[in-house]
């Protein structure tokens, strides 16, 4: 009987089991009971990343400086192109097709994550204690200053956006 | 046992025909692929056609394609050559093979064609 | 069609002696060579398959190697048996095409 299934790496046709083609190269024509499959390798620019029967390699994806795009990997027959996005800018999906600003940390919020090329800055509100007066794309809430420590005392209360005033304390207390 | 025994061969003027027969035996015949090759006097082996198990597909060298013909008979357990147009560069010993993963495992013993006037 | 080009085309050897026929393909063909060995007057036989694959009941003296474009047939200690014509013959591409042959014969 005629095989109805083939091993890994093949591929059933014409009542018969064909060697898949290997990553990078591509199908040029099945297997006969007499030839083995005939594969060619992928043309500059073009890749296949599995074992395939496609009759056309694809082409490497083009990393567009007017995205905000640049290579941060460059394809191989068996690999596409990797992009990522140049400095300041990030990524606006996994498939990164497109690049958008770093967002900043406006006052009152602290940088939690910086940004990568494939990741936004992570900002987060500073809690009672901390505080961001700049918008920023590194800086992190910082702590009030303690006018105990300095003995001095609080003149103005800090807020998230602002820090303690601290002055001398009033001797006649 | 594998046998394989060709028949037919013989005498023949330039462009007459000649059906080659090769008869087998000793195994399952309709479940493999099976050709033709030949051999010049003196000279080296040359595939001249194949036929597939199930599917039956046809394959020629460019030498031949368009003279000749392969088929089988499965029920016959027999193989074929139809040779039409021949020609003096035909001349050889013909031989018919059992293919398995790619290589011939079996032959006959050969049936000599000679094209001559 | 793929050109198959062998060699030496023959040579003269002694028994107990290493050989090694060698054959070339016009182009890549992976690793989709075999090797027959032909006697005078008999139908070939055949020795190797998949460049380096020893058919069933063949001798351990005989063996294959290589892939691409360049292949060779190794016979390690020589017997009075071996001394025929070997053919080389690809099945990367149709149609399957057979080296020139190499004639071994006795020194």
């Known amino acids: 009987e005629p095989p109805t299934a083939c091993r890994e790496k093949q591929y059933l046709i014409n009542s018969q089991c064909c060697s898949l083609c290997q990553p990078g190269q591509k199908l040029v024509s099945d297997c006969t009971e007499f030839t083995e499959t005939e594969c060619l390798p992928c043309g500059e620019s073009e890749f296949l990343d599995t074992w395939n029967r496609e009759t056309h390699c694809h082409q490497h994806k083009y990393c567009d400086p007017n995205l905000g795009l640049r290579v941060q990997q460059k394809g191989t027959s068996e690999t596409d192109t990797i992009c990522t996005c140049e400095e300041g800018w990030h990524c606006t999906s996994e498939a990164c097709e497109s690049c958008v600003l770093h967002r900043s940390c406006s006052p009152g919020f602290g940088v939690k994550q910086i940004a990568t090329g494939v990741s936004d800055t992570i900002c987060e509100p500073c809690p009672v204690g901390f505080f961001s007066n700049q918008s920023s794309l590194f800086e992190k809430c910082y702590p009030w200053t303690s006018c105990e420590d300095k003995n001095l005392e609080v003149l103005q209360k800090g807020t998230s956006q602002t820090n303690v005033i601290c002055g001398p304390q009033d001797r006649l207390r | 046992e594998v046998q394989l025994l060709e028949s037919g061969g013989g005498l023949v003027q330039p462009g007459g025909s000649l059906r080659l027969s090769c008869a087998a035996s000793?195994?399952?015949?309709?479940?493999?692929?099976m050709s033709w090759v030949r051999q010049a006097p003196g000279k080296g082996l040359e595939w001249v056609s194949g036929?597939?198990?199930?599917?039956?597909?046809?394959y020629y060298a460019d030498s031949v394609k368009g003279r000749f013909t392969i088929s089988r008979d499965n029920s016959k357990n027999t193989l074929y050559l139809q040779m039409n147009s021949l020609r003096a560069e035909d001349t050889a010993v013909y031989y018919c093979?059992?293919?398995?993963?790619?290589?011939?495992?079996?032959w006959g013993q050969g049936t000599l064609v000679t094209v001559s006037s | 069609d793929i050109q198959m080009t062998q060699s030496p085309s023959s040579l003269s050897a002694s028994v107990g002696d290493r050989v090694t026929i060698t054959c070339r393909a016009s182009?890549?063909?992976?690793?989709?060579l075999n090797w027959y060995q032909q006697k005078p007057g008999k139908a070939p036989k055949l020795l190797i398959y998949?460049?380096?694959s020893l058919q069933s009941g063949v001798p351990s003296r005989f063996s294959g190697s290589g892939s691409g474009t360049d292949f060779t047939l190794t016979i390690s200690s020589l017997q009075p048996e071996d001394f025929a014509t070997y053919y080389c013959?690809?099945?990367?591409?149709?149609?399957?095409?057979f080296g020139q042959g190499t004639k071994l014969e006795i020194k």
């Open positions: 093979a059992r293919y398995v993963n790619f290589g011939m495992d079996y």
């Open positions: 000793g195994f399952t015949f309709s479940s493999y692929a």
């Open positions: 036929i597939g198990s199930y599917g039956g597909g046809t």
């Open positions: 182009q890549s063909i992976s690793s989709y």
């Open positions: 998949a460049a380096s």
């Open positions: 013959q690809q099945y990367g591409r149709n149609p399957p095409t």
